[in-house]
């Protein structure tokens, strides 16, 4: 476990002609925000693919107005660090995008209105526990001026955050087959955390959360003794057929903790130790609340404003679970046919076909394109005897080996500036516009489109667009 | 031609909750960017929260960490799950749909909310 942290330390326009205009005015004062969304791995995501790593909004900048006719300087920026905390290790490699945000802070009605300003993105490699790193990104017009870094929380270290340190119970050394632990020479290496609850007798563990028995134990927890005979050993009523004496059924039997809590057996009953933000007999009641951000992906958090009162989790859609932690594998299905590689990517299910087919689920069997080849993912499509290639976001030509603008087809609605990145296209709304393309309007004109109000109702005066 | 029918609306009082539902004809929601707005008397209409067509959520600030919007693309409807209602909820809350093809933007009728004890 561990945190990404990230420093703006400027956001204004960058080098060269072709200043932008300043995002505020006297009129329509604003101020700035950021938020970064952080993905494992190198690979090329869809822009609307979850943030896996985690996301983080900073908290709003000063208020700042045009000063008239002075050039856009670099613009106030928000106070303190924009922290993604981290649960598992970290990945070493990892893509981001930082997305600058203005908010309005006109009089309209309804509160303020948001747009947003630029969005920078990138790959990189970074150690945890190293220096901070700088970037400067560009945005059209605007640039991003930054630092980040991974650092482990404790007990974690190590370029990942895999490694356990804690402090050495005697002075000169550490214990049989630990190392000390570097940069921390007065700690030492701790030993694997296993499966909760298992047997730190007769378990071991190679890998995190695993719990392996020693010979002559048994059991998901190696808390089940095997005897040396072909019996199991006594704790129940005698089997006539063998003459052993078979295990009744022991209190954690089946593990009656919930939320991880890890059993172990008292003389009447059981008891449960539970993970933190858990209590109860059985652990089942969760101290989180919201404000705790106990929602993994993405998933937003409704209710548990106390510790009495349970939270929900809405899960984004590719993710289940109570606290959305489990990404849903619905490829297991295999929905693709005829071969077709099936790509889970969260907010839907595409099929990626062979050659020769086509469909949404690579159902139609396409003659005329077999042996036909379309580069970067495009599906070759029979049309009239001929065949040609549906190209993937971002590519086009006769085999899909040229470089598409995805801006081309013009996908930003009511005016939204359409920006090309590596994930695919981004738009930025013009002011009272929202959405992915700018297809929610925030106060919708009074006029035209809008139906009578229902009886009893007076329908808002005409307005202008903020 | 795309048809939005609204329900779900009713008296409901402060703190309580209620789900509004939006049903589109002709069109399945998996295509189309869906909204629900609101007008009380004498306001603007305004944006309370919206599904893109490609599963991003948004919301309105006031709205935050009480209502969620969802698509059920078998029922072909879009939900508004409304917790912790206040009174200055009350409103008439429409269901929109922007339909990409023709960039054109549809309305349906209104159902109202009415959050009073």
């Known amino acids: 476990a561990g945190v990404f942290e990230l420093q703006i330390h400027s956001f204004g326009p960058g080098p060269g002609p072709g200043a932008p205009r300043s995002p505020c005015s006297a009129r329509l004062p604003c101020r700035l925000f950021f938020r970064v969304c952080l993905k494992p791995g190198l690979s090329e995501e869809a822009a609307e693919s979850p943030c896996a790593l985690g996301a983080a909004l900073s908290a709003r900048g000063p208020v700042y107005t045009e000063q008239p006719g002075a050039p856009a300087p670099d613009l106030p920026l928000p106070d303190g660090l924009l922290q993604v905390p981290f649960r598992d290790a970290w990945p070493g490699t990892f893509s981001f995008i930082i997305e600058t945000w203005r908010e309005e802070l006109g009089d309209q009605i309804g509160g303020p209105a948001w747009s947003l300003l630029a969005r920078v993105a990138g790959r990189r490699r970074l150690a945890a526990g190293g220096p901070w790193a700088r970037d400067i990104q560009r945005a059209g017009a605007w640039e991003l001026r930054f630092s980040y870094r991974a650092r482990c929380e404790p007990p974690a270290v190590g370029t990942a955050c895999t490694r356990l340190c804690r402090p050495r119970s005697a002075p000169s050394r550490c214990g049989p087959g630990l190392r000390p632990c570097a940069p921390l020479e007065d700690e030492c290496e701790a030993p694997l955390v296993c499966r909760a609850g298992c047997s730190p007798e007769h378990g071991f563990c190679e890998q995190p959360g695993e719990c392996r028995c020693l010979e002559g134990w048994t059991g998901p927890l190696c808390t089940v003794p095997v005897s040396t005979s072909s019996c199991l050993s006594p704790r129940g009523p005698s089997s006539a057929t063998t003459g052993c004496l078979v295990p009744g059924p022991g209190p954690c039997d089946g593990n009656p903790c919930a939320n991880g809590g890890s059993c172990s057996e008292t003389p009447r009953s059981f008891e449960c130790t539970c993970p933190r933000g858990f209590y109860g007999l059985r652990c089942e009641v969760s101290g989180v609340t919201c404000a705790d951000g106990p929602c993994f992906n993405g998933g937003l958090c409704v209710g548990g404003a106390d510790p009495d009162s349970a939270y929900i989790c809405h899960c984004p859609p590719g993710f289940q679970g109570s606290n959305c932690e489990k990404r849903v594998d619905r490829c297991s299905l295999q929905p693709c046919r005829n071969g077709g590689l099936c790509l889970d990517l969260g907010h839907a299910l595409r099929c990626r076909c062979r050659a020769g087919f086509a469909g949404p689920r690579c159902e139609h069997d396409l003659d005329d394109c077999a042996g036909r080849a379309c580069a970067n993912g495009g599906t070759c499509v029979e049309g009239g005897g001929a065949h040609r290639c549906s190209c993937a976001l971002g590519f086009g030509g006769r085999d899909c080996r040229e470089r598409a603008d995805p801006c081309a087809a013009r996908p930003c609605a009511h005016g939204g500036r359409c920006y090309a990145h590596f994930s695919g296209l981004v738009c930025a709304c013009a002011p009272g516009y929202m959405g992915a393309r700018c297809e929610f309007p925030v106060h919708p004109d009074g006029a035209s489109a809008l139906p009578a109000a229902p009886p009893g109702l007076r329908p808002g005066d005409p307005q202008r667009y903020l | 031609e795309v048809q939005l029918v609204e329900s779900g609306g009713g008296l409901v009082q402060p703190g309580g909750s209620l789900t509004l539902s939006c049903a589109a004809s002709?069109?399945?929601?998996?295509?189309?960017?869906i909204a629900w707005y609101r007008q009380a008397p004498g306001k603007k209409r305004e944006l309370v929260a919206g599904?893109?067509?490609?599963?991003?959520?948004h919301y309105f600030d006031s709205v935050k960490g009480r209502f969620t919007i969802s698509r059920d693309n078998a029922k072909n409807s879009v939900y508004l799950q409304m917790n912790s209602l206040r009174a200055e909820d009350t409103a008439v809350y429409y269901c929109?749909?922007?339909?990409?093809?023709?960039?054109?933007?549809?309305w349906g009728q209104g159902t109202l909310v009415t959050v009073s004890s």
């Open positions: 002709a069109d399945s929601v998996s295509f189309l960017s």
């Open positions: 929109y749909a922007y339909r990409w093809e023709e960039s054109r933007q549809y």
């Open positions: 599904i893109s067509d490609d599963g991003s959520k």
